[in-house]
Amino acid sequence: GNLKHKCFRNSLENNETLESIMNTLESEEDFRKYFYYLEGSKDALLCGFST
């Protein structure tokens, strides 16, 4: 099934909106990259998965 992401960042940069972030996270791999490439901290993203 499709992976749906519920993610909340502590801060937004580069004029991002939560909606734009959600649109970017279309796969678990994207989520992994956001989490480990861009944030660098487990405290920066509070996320859960639902299918």
Partner: antibody, heavy 117, light 113 residues
């Protein structure tokens, strides 16, 4: 055929500015995270920057943070690297790379940046 | 940052020999959600761009000869070249794709004896 073609390198004085471009073709550019990786003469590979598929998320190596800006134009299938306040230690061959799943499955041929007075 | 350490820094091999290159990461590159190691190996021939050989520690990239193989998990990884060929003379790099800053090993130069 996937192709990544870098351009915009050259000789610049310390403190100067360059904008590198990477023209992508042969794949759906907007589906991929993209990176810049550089290689100083006779040295190893050094990661520079990454940008997410939509362009809203970016990150930089500490060595270039605050001086370099990565961006992309998905309508033009082009990746950019704006390089300000260039230093001699930025002298390198700059590669545009495609990120598949944490690995770089395609590399361009690179564009040479030389910072010297 | 995750540090990547390769050994040896250089090796000389004759055609037909087996070459082994090691790569150690300073912390785990195993992603628990999918149990994949985000470790890749590249070949860079003189004057050329790097070429992906192995990803996820042990998966051979399409078109790569089967004499190249990768193994290992968590923090310790190995690239093996069986039946070394003259065209395999190059510098080999490992790279972790687990977290930014993405980092490379310092490279291992493999020369033809």
């Amino acid at each position: 055929e996937v192709q990544l073609v870098e351009s915009g390198g050259g000789l610049v004085q310390p403190g100067g500015t360059l904008r590198l471009s990477c023209a992508a073709s042969g794949f759906t550019f907007s589906n991929y995270w993209m990176h810049w990786v550089r290689q100083a003469p006779g040295k190893g590979l050094e990661w520079v920057s990454v940008i997410d598929r939509g362009g809203g998320g970016t990150r930089y190596a500490d060595s270039v943070k605050g001086r370099f800006t990565i961006s992309r134009d998905n309508a033009k299938n082009t990746l950019y690297l704006r390089m300000n306040s260039l230093k001699p230690e930025d002298t390198a061959l700059y590669y545009c790379t495609r990120d598949r799943n944490g690995e770089y499955d395609y590399w361009g041929r690179g564009t040479q940046v030389t910072v010297s007075s | 940052d995750i540090q990547m350490t390769q050994s040896p820094s250089s090796v000389t091999a004759s055609a037909g020999e087996k070459v082994t290159i090691n790569c150690k990461s300073s912390q785990s590159v195993l992603y628990s959600s999918n149990q994949k190691n985000y470790l890749a190996w590249y070949q860079q021939r003189l004057g050329q761009s790097p070429r992906l050989l192995i990803y996820w520690a042990s998966t051979r990239e399409s078109g790569v000869p089967d004499r190249f193989s990768g193994s290992g998990s968590t923090t310790d990884f190995t690239l093996t070249i069986n039946n070394f060929q003259p065209e395999d003379a190059a510098v080999y790099y490992c790279q972790q794709g687990y977290s930014a800053p993405l980092t490379f090993g310092q490279g291992t130069k493999v020369e033809l004896k």
